[in-house]
């Protein structure tokens, strides 16, 4: 592990009450093809454990949804990736919304450090699909 | 090679008969900007030779697609990356559905293992594009 | 840097006059998020200077959009990432229409060369976001 | 094996409309498109407008005002209306089911066809 | 509109020779990877018949003396050997966008 090479791909554990937008993620071989080989869950939330530059990338799916599903609702449902502790670095750096779809998917290089913990904050009252071909959430350090 | 950088861009062939779902890909530097370095091509399906945890990504965009094309069509459109063979470790990898959008695409992080096949299954009616900047799939070696 | 791990995560800067489809970018750390490290910008625009294989990443989000917004348009907005020069290797490389969507996302491997400048075109009359979580272009060199 | 049987009234008077149902068995109508195309000798094949597996219909733009195009997917049936029929839409009518690939518009299975005259 | 313009309007071919059709667009039909030009068959008192889509692939139980040729806007449709009971009207058929258009047609006659 010393090269660095921490990496860990998560699944959707469940979403938080209803006054918390928060994705609770889980990973381990146990759950299937998840995974955390360097960063660590904190209470479902990622949180780093070596400085550098990171590939995070991630894909939600609204659960039972169509075409129709995103537009019969009058906010907007949008994710967010971000930084969230601890606060004096809290950043957004990564948000879509889903317009007339069902499933967001994107990726960004984006420098992190050793102590940072990633929330996704999916605000809206859709439901997320727990289906881990459909939505999960992943980083890959890539350089120092 | 021994470093097991493995990796491979794709582009599209063709599609199957009309029972079978699968995409066949093609890749070579005679072809334009596809490659294989590592993994091979089985009858177009991506055959992996190292074990690792890889990034998939992919792109698939529906030929002469504009936002109503995909509603027109009462099945919907959908587009799965799995582990097609050998049939002990099939499994479903990464799936999105085309809701009154043309384009899908996504990545993710999954280990994979010598000899693994993986297969992109377009269900539904609907022609991608063959176009090279349009639709790709590949696959990058990232750690053991 | 002599790995070889040529980096960059861009942001937006702002569009081109009228009749100049590209995107210029920007990046450093006083900026927010963004970096070069390696590739180099001339004029807005990513020049590499390593040869290899790279993942380009980009997102693009449309500003003040609603799921109406790009059906409101007659001609259809793309978003195209390619080489633009030298014009000898000029090449389209990674495709996306937003129709009926606010959000491109998407990211492929592809051989680049020293010298190579690459453009981000954005056709039609819609103006990109320049939030630094919804629009930003990258590179990864990932192997030789 | 696939079939679209077409029936309809052979002669339509001036500014009247025309109707024609095409039945369809082999295939549903929850896959495929149906097409109708009709043809005269003074204008050849001219395509006139689709229904779609999901219910949705594209026309060609001449004939939007006056053309519908509806189906009752559990009866297998498509139903064809044009309205204020003149002398120049004389010609046969056919419905053509739409290729396996949704976008490729091409039609290999056709209907017999219906023999349309406009005459007072 | 694309128009699809047909040559000759009419051919006689002796039994075992070639036929060779033409039908040119006025715009190309080319798209996401595709050429979007099909050809059909129809003999006198019967609907037209689907013979190639996608300028050279054979519909269903289409006999191989079919092939079609071509890209852009210039195609070519060739029956060789010619049979007896190849007499008929062929159509060409772009499908690049809506409306859908087809050519005049080209009539095969044996002598």
């Known amino acids: 592990e010393s090269l660095g090479w921490d990496i860990a791909e998560l699944q959707l554990n469940h979403t938080g009450p209803q006054q918390d937008p928060r994705l609770y993620w889980q990973g381990g071989p146990a759950l299937g093809r998840s995974f955390l080989r360097g960063p660590e869950l904190d209470k479902g939330q990622l949180r780093i454990r070596r400085d550098g530059i990171y590939m995070v990338h991630i894909q939600v799916t609204l659960a039972i949804c169509s075409s129709t599903s995103t537009s019969r609702h009058h906010h907007p449902t949008t994710l967010a990736v971000g930084i969230c502790s601890p606060a004096s670095r809290s950043i957004s750096l990564l948000r879509l919304s889903f317009h007339q779809g069902c499933t967001i998917a994107s990726q960004r290089l984006t420098p992190l450090a050793r102590g940072d913990t990633l929330c996704t904050n999916l605000t809206g009252t859709l439901l997320p699909s727990r289906n881990t071909d459909e939505t999960f959430f992943g980083v890959q350090w890539v350089r120092p | 090679e021994s470093l097991g950088w493995d990796i491979a861009e794709l582009q599209l062939n063709h599609t199957g008969p009309q029972q079978d779902p699968r995409l066949y890909w093609q890749g070579g530097p005679a072809l334009g900007r596809s490659f294989l370095r590592g993994p091979e091509l089985d009858k177009g399906q991506l055959r992996i030779r190292r074990d690792g945890i890889y990034m998939v990504h992919i792109q698939v965009t529906l030929a002469i697609c504009s936002s109503t094309s995909t509603s027109r069509h009462h099945h919907p459109t959908t587009l799965a990356v799995g582990i097609c063979s050998p049939a002990s470790r099939s499994i479903s990898l990464l799936r999105l559905s085309f809701h009154q959008g043309c384009t899908i695409a996504s990545q993710r992080l999954t280990p994979l293992a010598r000899g693994d096949t993986l297969c992109t299954n377009l269900t539904g009616t609907l022609l991608p594009s063959r176009n090279t900047d349009e639709t790709f799939f590949g696959v990058q070696w990232v750690r053991p | 840097e002599s790995l070889g791990w040529d980096i960059a995560e861009l942001q937006l800067n702002h569009t081109g006059p009228q009749q100049d489809p590209r995107l210029y970018w920007q990046g450093g750390p006083a900026l927010g998020r963004s970096f070069l490290r390696g590739p180099e910008l001339d004029k807005g625009q990513l020049r590499i200077r390593r040869d290899g294989i790279y993942m380009v990443h980009i997102q693009v989000t449309l500003a003040i959009c609603s799921s109406t917004s790009t059906s409101r348009h007659h001609h259809p907005t793309t978003l195209a990432v390619g080489i633009c020069s030298p014009a000898s290797r000029s090449i389209s490389l990674l495709r996306l229409s937003f129709h009926q969507g606010c959000t491109i996302a998407s990211q492929r491997l592809t051989p680049l060369a020293r010298g190579d400048t690459l453009c981000t075109n954005l056709t039609g009359t819609l103006l990109p976001s320049r939030n630094t979580d919804e629009t930003f272009f990258g590179v990864q060199w990932v192997r030789p | 094996q696939v079939q679209l049987k077409q029936s309809g009234p052979g002669l339509v008077q001036p500014s009247q409309s025309l109707s024609i149902t095409c039945t369809v068995s082999?295939?549903?109508?929850?896959?495929?498109?149906v097409h109708w195309v009709r043809q005269s000798p003074g204008k050849g094949l001219e395509w006139l407008g689709v229904i779609w597996s999901a219910g949705i219909t594209d026309y060609n733009a001449p004939f939007i005002s006056r053309l519908s195009i509806t189906k009752d997917n559990s009866k297998s049936q498509v139903f064809f209306k044009m309205n204020s029929l003149q002398a120049d839409d004389t010609a046969i009518y056919y419905c053509?089911?739409?290729?396996?690939?949704?976008?490729?518009?091409?039609?290999?299975?056709w209907g017999q066809g219906t023999s349309v005259t406009v005459s007072s | 509109d694309i128009v699809l313009t047909q040559s000759p309007a009419s051919l006689a071919v002796s039994l075992g020779q070639r036929a060779t059709i033409s039908c040119r667009a006025n715009?190309?039909?080319?798209?996401?990877?595709?050429?979007?030009m099909h050809w059909y068959q129809q003999k006198p008192g019967q609907p037209p018949k689907l013979l190639i889509y996608?300028?050279?692939n054979l519909a269903s139980g289409v006999p191989a003396r079919f092939s079609g040729s071509g890209s852009g806007t210039d195609f070519t449709l060739n029956i060789h050997p010619v049979e007896g009971e190849d007499a008929a009207t062929y159509y060409c058929q772009h499908s690049r966008e809506f409306p859908l258009t087809f050519g005049a047609g080209t009539k095969l006659e044996l002598k």
């Open positions: 715009k190309s039909v080319s798209a996401s990877g595709y050429t979007f």
């Open positions: 082999g295939f549903s109508l929850t896959t495929y498109g």
């Open positions: 053509a089911r739409n290729d396996y690939y949704g976008n490729l518009y091409a039609m290999d299975y």
């Open positions: 996608l300028v050279s």
